[in-house]
């Protein structure tokens, strides 16, 4: 073999051992009767050599690197040639490398002729063995843009400051053209832009730079998708990690030509948009990472382009004929901004009247169907009113607050089911008794069930939110003075499986003056956290609430408050707390606007905690959090 490299060609040829094989006999490059395992040929050199074996392709690889300097002179733009021609090279696995160095202000664009490129992930290989490895540069740091095979959608890659393109050809491959050209562009002001062109239906899997390692800190990378107008594109994230941000927030942004809401900003953990018509851009923006513990940002995603879905002809029956004072609304879930580019998602009544919102009322049987590619874009909100106008008729009457099975069988997620419970003023009150004891949601012990009950006053002038409650706690019942709304709110699709855990009975009971009374029967196993209504906004003025806390005979209860002082400042009146032993009626009274809150106290018998508010000055509200823990009694002190 003879390889002659023209002077000033800036080409270096390197023949070296490839990955070691288990072949018995080694092979050498023979030059001037010397046996070597590596041969480097520089511009202006002419070297004659042979191999010491019959099949050097099993032993050696050849790298041909051309350095293109766009810093000191004009750049040789246009179609890139394979130099030296593959016919002049020994038949080894070949890697042609083009290393282009340019100023930061210069954009470089690699244009790939058909077939376009398909990105592959770590551990994957190309069927024909032809791979394209592309990397960029940020100052002195090399950044891997990705490894690509033929027969894909990637048509152009734009970078700045420099690009390194490596084309790997197996020894048996007849290819004798590079398949790409280089053009200059204005600065792209980001790490890179990858253009992906879909001619018809198909999918593309793409990855952030350096994948599976971390995306460079505080960088921006953009993918431009060219999609025929009659097709729809959906994005799904296959794999992602977030780094630890010190400043800014990692995010993806969608830009849709013609949209009035550009850019659409999403967190990586959000559900990404689907059913987009026409072209769109997706950008990944990094953040300033924590120097001590940066973590890594990485993203692997898929774009699926297909014809709009053939909508299901399935009819769903919603029978509300036996219901009273109830309305069911199917509507789009709120999105951060309305995305006008997303095709409509409709719900139809009797398959004729279709709209994005539909409200069904009680007293009838309804037939509905859906014209929507993704039913998770919709949810249901239901309101039902249970009212008592005649206190003589209602007293002691009970109603079950349960989601009807017809509603649970719909293919749309239930968001809220609200019961408005109305009583005659100053005549009756309400008691809520759950099928399973409830836990109050607190920061210290959050609910992690698929649904919760939100209990709030339903009197328009009163801003009183009792709290969020979920099954699996110690609250046996909640008594409230007057009108309330109880909302069953779902937090996960698994509510369908957990629906059997719901179950709340409301009864009308004789009127009492306190705003609310919670009956608590703690379990010996866990700490019960309780907090005053209207947490964060403060207990309303002149409002009184009580907790009736049961202590079993063989247990002792520890009552603990979570701050030293209540923090309330009274404008008028006094705020106080009474802790009263139910057996002896012995009580302790604490002035909440003056005294420190009591230290942890032990109670051997059931007791009351009553908190009554004054009219506080603004900003100095009454918020109390306390816990009750049962432990076995060691000594009987009675």
């Amino acid at each position: 073999f003879e390889i002659a490299l023209p002077r000033e060609s800036n080409i270096t040829v390197l023949i070296k051992l490839g990955t070691p094989t288990l072949l018995a006999k080694p092979c050498y490059i023979v030059i001037s009767k010397r046996h070597i395992t590596m041969l480097s040929i520089k511009s202006g050199e002419r070297i004659v050599f042979t191999f010491s074996c019959q099949s050097p392709e099993n032993h050696f690889v050849i790298e041909i690197q051309k350095n293109i300097d766009c810093m000191s002179g004009p750049c040789p733009f246009g179609e890139v040639q394979l130099q030296p021609s593959t016919s002049l090279l020994p038949t080894l696995n070949r890697t042609f490398i083009w290393d282009v160095k340019a100023h930061k202000s210069i954009g470089l664009e690699l244009q790939f002729s058909i077939p376009r490129l398909r990105q592959i992930g770590p551990g994957e290989s190309c069927p024909d063995g032809v791979t394209h490895s592309i990397s960029g540069r940020i100052d002195a740091t090399v950044v891997r843009i990705g490894t690509f095979c033929s027969n894909g959608t990637v048509s152009r890659i734009k970078m700045q400051e420099g690009v390194k393109m490596a084309l790997h050809l197996p020894w048996f491959h007849p290819r004798n053209v590079s398949g790409f050209s280089i053009a200059n562009r204005s600065s792209i002001k980001r790490l890179c832009i990858i253009e992906s062109v879909f001619e018809g239906e198909g999918s593309a899997t793409l990855m952030s730079a350096n994948y599976p390692e971390g995306f460079p800190e505080d960088e921006l990378m953009t993918w431009q998708f060219v999609v025929p107008a009659h097709l729809r594109a959906s994005v799904s994230f296959l794999n992602f990690n977030l780094s630890n941000c010190e400043r800014k927030e990692e995010r993806v942004e969608y830009y849709i030509p013609g949209s009035t809401t550009n850019p659409e900003v999403f967190k990586l953990e959000d559900k990404q948009p689907g059913n987009m018509a026409g072209n769109f851009n997706l950008s990944l923006q990094g953040c300033d990472q924590d120097a001590q513990s940066p973590g890594i940002l990485r993203l692997q995603f898929q774009v699926l382009v297909q014809h709009p879905q053939n909508e299901s002809n399935k009819i769903y029956v919603v029978d509300l004929s036996n219901e009273r004072a109830m309305s069911l609304t199917i509507e789009p879930r709120p999105v951060k901004q309305s995305r006008k580019f997303v095709p409509g998602c409709f719900v139809c009544l009797e398959s004729r009247t279709c709209s994005s919102n539909l409200t069904l009322t009680s007293g009838s049987k309804h037939k509905i169907s859906f014209l929507c590619d993704d039913l998770t874009r919709l949810w249901m909100n239901v309101e039902k009113t249970i009212s008592c106008t005649d206190h003589r008729y209602c007293q002691r009457k009970s109603y079950s607050l349960q989601v009807p099975s017809d509603i649970l069988h719909l293919p749309v997620e239930l968001h809220d089911f609200s019961w408005k419970l109305l009583v005659p003023k100053d005549r009756l009150s309400l008691v809520l008794v759950p099928a399973q004891k409830l836990q109050q949601h607190t920061h210290e012990k959050p609910c992690n069930t698929s649904f919760s009950y939100l209990v709030a006053s339903a009197i328009p002038s009163q801003d009183l939110y009792f709290g969020s409650f979920c099954p699996g706690g110690s609250i046996k019942q909640i008594q409230v003075k007057q009108n309330i709304s109880v909302t069953l709110r779902t937090f996960a699709p698994s509510f369908q499986q957990e629906a059997s855990r719901q179950g709340l009975t409301v009864s009308f009971i004789p009127y009492f003056k306190e705003e609310g009374v919670f009956t608590v029967t703690p379990d010996t196993k866990s700490k019960v956290y309780l907090r005053t209504p209207n947490w964060d906004r403060g207990l309303p003025s002149l409002t009184s609430v009580s907790w009736n806390i049961s202590v079993p005979r063989d247990q002792v209860a520890c009552l603990t408050f979570f701050k030293e002082r209540s923090g309330v400042v009274c404008q008028t009146g006094r705020a106080f707390m009474i802790i009263q032993e139910q057996r002896t009626r012995a009580e302790e009274i604490f002035s909440l606007d003056e005294d420190v809150l009591p230290k942890p106290s032990f109670h051997h018998h059931s007791f009351w905690v009553n908190i009554s508010n004054c009219s506080p000055t603004s900003g100095k509200q009454l918020d109390l959090l306390f816990s009750v823990t049962l432990t076995p009694r060691t000594v009987d002190l009675t």
Partner: antibody, heavy 117, light 111 residues
Amino acid sequence: EVQLQESGAELARPGASVKLSCKASGYTFTSYWMQWVKQRPGQGLEWIGAIYPGDGDTRYTQKFKGKATLTADKSSSTAYMQLSSLASEDSAVYYCAGYDAPWFAYWGQGTLVTVSS
Amino acid sequence: NIVLTQSPASLAVSLGQRATISCRASESVDSYGNSFMHWYQQKPGQPPKLLIYLASNLESGVPARFSGSGSRTDFTLTIDPVEADDAATYYCQQNNEDPWTFGGGTKLEIK
């Protein structure tokens, strides 16, 4: 298994000549250099020269041009070194060394040449 | 001629410690991307034994305690950790240019 078998010890008079042999086996004799190295007692290694049996190409260090003549017989896979005009300073152990790439991994056991009147 | 200067001429190293031998060439022994420098071990009464070829490649059967490094004019043989059996004289040889030449040798003694 590769072997280089050198001829036995030689006792020669000053001014005489000796021809040392080195028979190779276990590798392709014609494809690799055979080098010859001199080592005087308690001294270091001194390169004499090398021959490429495939085409008879020879290389010598200046000091041994005219003193040593390297030849090879392809048919018997044997390399020879003739030392002429022997003097007492030619008394030494002479090694042949060969290889099957990439370098001289195989050495003969050495031939002791003693020049004495 | 390319002159190879080995240093030190002799050295004593404790068992388990590292031994480093240097070989400096009067001009570069690199070409075609290779360093044509090789290392041998010789024990009394025996022919030399190849340890390292082309500056850094370990000959088959030689323990990984031996390593070679360097390029152009400066080369190093390292033995780490040294064992009792390593007591010998070590030589470098170049074949980049005719005549091929040897270094003067370094005698390694184990303490």
